[in-house]
Amino acid sequence: AESCTSRPHITVVEGEPFYLKHCSCSLAHEIETTTKSWYKSSGSQEHVELNPRSSSRIALHDCVLEFWPVELNDTGSYFFQMKNYTQKWKLNVIRRNKHSCFTERQVTSKIVEVKKFFQITCENSYYQTLVNSTSLYKNCKKLLLENNKNPTIKKNAEFEDQGYYSCVHFLHHNGKLFNITKTFNITIVEDRSNIVPVLLGPKLNHVAVELGKNVRLNCSALLNEEDVIYWMFGEENGSDPNIHEEKEMRIMTPEGKWHASKVLRIENIGESNLNVLYNCTVASTGGTDTKSFILVRKADMADIPGHVFTR
């Protein structure tokens, strides 16, 4: 039997069949004569009793309140009451993403290590008897799999397996067709062992600049998720209004580590910005690594060997 709905806060997507099952179900069968009631409260309305007459979309069966389907205006608090037993749920119905086969806020994320066993099984035990067919999509493209009742993927993970997998169950109820979507965001990572973070490029960079112009110093690193990359420039705080740290950007590498980039933007370069160290540091549990940038006036370039310059 399908387990009861124990989570007090539930988010669902509009337009899909949905049910609430109270958690004293076995007890309810023992006392058939006891009055059992379902209520809803939302905003202005306090505790309105629910019954099939309240809405053609609502059905009541023993321990279950069903929605065919659930809609945005079903958002609210729901109560089941029987004798001195009460159970409460807070239901939040969110808008369907009409431009995708799934709704972002209803995605379950899973991380799978490369070469480890990876499995996705499409099943829905509560609606099982009503389901006509089930399709599995990867990044909203249908996968051609043998079993169209419970499509399944079972394999050793490869990096190409990364993506959004959506199980879509198609079912009929009272002559209408419905579908229920469950989506997994699968991220394939290298083994979980940490790397020693590394700053990319030379440790010391002389940058040729012109006074009054702007320059962007880019600092990039390969690092672990918890490592940080930051700029240090002089003891005083960013008292120089011309110096701006841009937002750090991160993207996962195919190996499951992180490529981070942080730009220091210096506008309207003045004499005070020349021949001082702008340090970019990556800090990890294993220590720190630093690379330095020095701004040099273009006119003074001749004094420095060509190989130490960066553009």
Epitope: R105, E226, E248, M249
Partner: nanobody, 122 residues
Framework: EVQLVESGGDLVQPGGSLRLSCAPS????????MRWYRQAPGKQREWVAS???????NYANSVEGRFTVSRDNAKNTVYLQVNSLKPEDTAVYYC????????????????WGQGTQVTVSS
């Protein structure tokens, strides 16, 4: 637009403790590392601690052993438990997180909170 909101800052005596919290408001798809920075008057902002999605942590030497960073992934919330506070810990504490606003984005982008003031004084 995503915003980070910090709370928990206060005036506290040396040796005292505080718990700072930070959570995003607005629609987000995924959060990567969450970090705490601080900025003392007249100083540059400095990194304090960070925590990965899986719970791995990383601390600046100046706070190691006194500060503890933790997070609740279900609530997208990060905490900083600050113990054995010293006058030199006085600063505005900023929350920072790498956030992917939607599933179509491949890049996590850095967001900052407005800061919460921690003052250590007798």
């Amino acid at each position: 637009e995503v915003q980070l909101v910090e709370s928990g800052g206060d005036l506290v005596q040396p040796g005292g403790s505080l718990r700072l919290s930070c959570a995003p408001s607005g629609s987000i798809f995924s959060i990567n590392a969450m970090r705490w920075y601080r900025q003392a008057p007249g100083k540059q902002r400095e990194w304090v601690a960070s925590i990965a999605t899986g719970g791995n942590t990383n601390y600046a030497n100046s706070v190691e052993g006194r500060f503890t960073v933790s997070r609740d992934n279900a609530k997208n919330t990060v905490y900083l438990q600050v113990n054995s506070l010293k006058p030199e810990d006085t600063a505005v504490y900023y929350c920072n997180a790498l956030i992917k606003p939607s599933s179509t984005d491949r890049i996590f982008e850095e967001y900052w909170g407005q800061g919460t003031q921690v003052t250590v004084s007798s």
